[in-house]
Every structure is written in C-alpha cells, then in structure tokens.
C-alpha cells in the first residue's frame, strides 16, 4: 500500500517517502525505490534555512553601503545575512532594506531616547525648569542653573530654549 503521509523531514513523491535535504543543501534528485534523495551543498553566498526539497538555494541578502547599510552578521549556508545601518543611521523598515539619518531634536526639545540601528531618535519638549539650546541627536534637556546655590539672583528668566541668567544680589546700602 503506497503511503499517503510521510514522517517528519520526509516528503511524498511518486507514491514514495523521500528524505528532505538538510538546511544548507538543495535537492538534486528525488529518491527512488533503489536510491536515496540526492542533495548538494549551497554555493558561495547562498543559503537554505530549513529541511527542504528546493532545487535552488536563496542568495544571501546584500547590505548595500550606498543605502547606508552594513553587515551585522554574515550569512552561512544555513542562514541569511543580517543587515543593519551605519552609525548615525537607522532602518526604514523591519526588513532593513535601507537607512535614513537619525533625526535631531530641535532647540526646546531634548532627546528622550537615543536612536539605534533600528529605531529613530525620540524627542520630548523640555518641561519648565529645563532647556535645550541646540539641535542634537544626543543632548537631553538640561536643568536651568540654580542661581541661589551660587549666592546669585535670577536676572533673566529661563525658557525651554535658554538658561536663566544669574546676577549679583543688590546690596542694601
């Protein structure tokens, strides 16, 4: 009685259960009554990551430096290459097919979370008592200078973009 289903790591062909090719190898010829499945290793820059009956291996992903990409981990015969972005850039999608420059936080805003290879900079408005006077992808909001601790008084109030200006206390004559 010919089988209708096969064991794990096997496939049904011509009413017969043949062994699948292991990861890193492709199918050359199906098994027969007298011969085993014939498999061949994937070539240079190729891979197959599952037990398979593929006749062609997949090409490793190319991390194109012109798109801001670099190789995070090189592919093997069983795994694809993993791309990520060069320093100062982040992926535009989960597949990381291209990169864009990290955004900077404008004056009045500080960095809440520094960008990574896969996520952009997260900015936040500087709350009362804090300021940022630069456009930066790294700088957080800085606290206003405390004039009191320096035995000075506030001569000019701070804003979300400027620090307070301290000055000497008026002496009573």
């Amino acid at each position: 009685e010919p089988p209708t289903a096969c064991r794990e790591k096997q496939y049904l062909i011509n009413s017969q259960c043949c062994s699948l090719c292991q990861p890193g190898q492709k199918l050359v010829s199906d098994c027969t009554e007298f011969t085993e499945t014939e498999c061949l290793p994937c070539g240079e820059s190729e891979f197959l990551d599952t037990w398979n009956r593929e006749t062609h291996c997949h090409q490793h992903k190319y991390c194109d430096p012109n798109l801001g990409l670099r190789v995070q981990q090189k592919g093997t015969s069983e795994t694809d290459t993993i791309c990520t972005c060069e320093e100062g850039w982040h992926c535009t999608s989960e597949a990381c097919e291209s990169c864009v420059l990290h955004r900077s936080c404008s004056p009045g805003f500080g960095v809440k979370q520094i960008a990574t290879g896969v996520s952009d900079t997260i900015c936040e408005p500087c709350p009362v008592g804090f300021f940022s006077n630069v456009s930066s992808a790294f700088e957080k909001c800085h606290p206003w200078t405390s004039c009191e601790t320096k035995d000075l008084v506030v001569q000019q109030a701070g804003t979300n973009k400027t620090d307070v200006v301290c000055g000497p206390q008026d002496r009573l004559r």
Epitope: E44, S45, Q72, T84
Partner: antibody, heavy 114, light 110 residues
Framework: QSLEESGGRLVTPGTPLTLTCTVS????????MGWVRQAPGKGLEYIGV??????ISYYATWAEGRFTISKASTTVDLKITSPTTEDTATYFC??????????WGPGTLVTVSS | AVLTQTPSSVSAAVGGTVNIGCQSS????????LAWYQQKPGQPPKLLIY???TLASGVPSRFKGSGSGTQFTLTISDVQCADATTYYC???????????FGGGTEVVVK
Amino acid sequence: QSLEESGGRLVTPGTPLTLTCTVSGIDLSSYAMGWVRQAPGKGLEYIGVIASNSGISYYATWAEGRFTISKASTTVDLKITSPTTEDTATYFCVRGYIGDGALWGPGTLVTVSS
Amino acid sequence: AVLTQTPSSVSAAVGGTVNIGCQSSKSVYYNNWLAWYQQKPGQPPKLLIYRASTLASGVPSRFKGSGSGTQFTLTISDVQCADATTYYCAGGYSSDSDTTFGGGTEVVVK
C-alpha cells in the same frame, strides 16, 4: 568608539593565555569581532571572528583548535590554548569583518619563550 | 583562499603614482569584499578602502580602489612622503574561515 587589548605578556610554552579586548561605545550584538596577529617584522595573519547575533566563532583553518574566541557584554576574549614560540606576536582586536573594513585596537604583545 | 599581493616593494617619486595589485585564488564575497589597509611602524593597520572601491571616512581621495571578483588594485596618486609605509589587502569570503590578508607591499617614496 574604541577597543583596547590587554593580557599580553611573557609566557612559557604550553601555558594557556587569555587576551581581552575591552570595547567602549560599541554594541557587541551589532558587530562581528575578530582577532588578527602580527609576528615581529612579519605580515598580518587572520585568526578568527565571533558573529554578532549567534555568538558563533569561526577560525582560520590553521587556527582551529589552537585558539578560542568568546565574548561578554563589553569584552571579547582570545584564548591561546597551548602557546608555542611561533605564537610570539602582537595581537589585534578588530571591530567588524576584516574583508569589509574594520576598526582596529592598538594591539597587545605576547612573547612565548622558555 | 590565497591573496597574492604585487609587488612586495615599490618606489615612487613625490607627486607620482603607485599601483598595488591583489589577486585572490577565488572570488571574494559578493565579488567586492576586498579591503585595503595602511600600516605605519608601531601602529595598528588603518582602513583605507572597503568593498573594493569605497573610500573610508577621512581618507584622502588620492587613494583609489578598483576591481571585482578576483583582481583588485589600489592606486595612490600624487604620492606624498607620508604614504611611505606598508599596505595590505584583505579578502572576505563566503566562509569566514577563508578570510585572509595579502603579503603586504612596502611603498618607498624618493
């Protein structure tokens, strides 16, 4: 971003030695890290690399069994299993794949002598 | 893999041009995983060119890389006294175990 090797010293043949590469500002889960050596007055010799995500180490054919590369969160180690006088060299730690452009540490000198 | 670098030594006059060849016994990864490094005495190698022809950050445009597959060339034009040192090519392959360096080329500037 910087990397610095340490652990290089004078050892007697057969005494295992571990060199450490300490990184700063480099995410080791995002970069492959390799080791290269250079005997005095000679050329550069590739030892091996440890992959970023998988942490699997790959070695030059000649280096297989003679060296072990491993990593922690901010360090990458190179263990010289059983040094011989031929292993006298400056050992460099490198960020990235050699053939795809890499950043190098200043190196650490290992002298093997009885 | 084997990387054969030629010549092992070359001399040039200031302002002249130098060509260094690098031949691989098999194709490098993606046909372009070939880097060029400059090494001055007592210093670690410094990256000049990667992906066969991409100039590394901060490297003068006098340095130019070309080639693909198994044949590569580093060209230094308008040679300066500071260029007098040793240059290495390095190849990356499908298998990381095959990564290798060329034997080096010493550039002498007259």
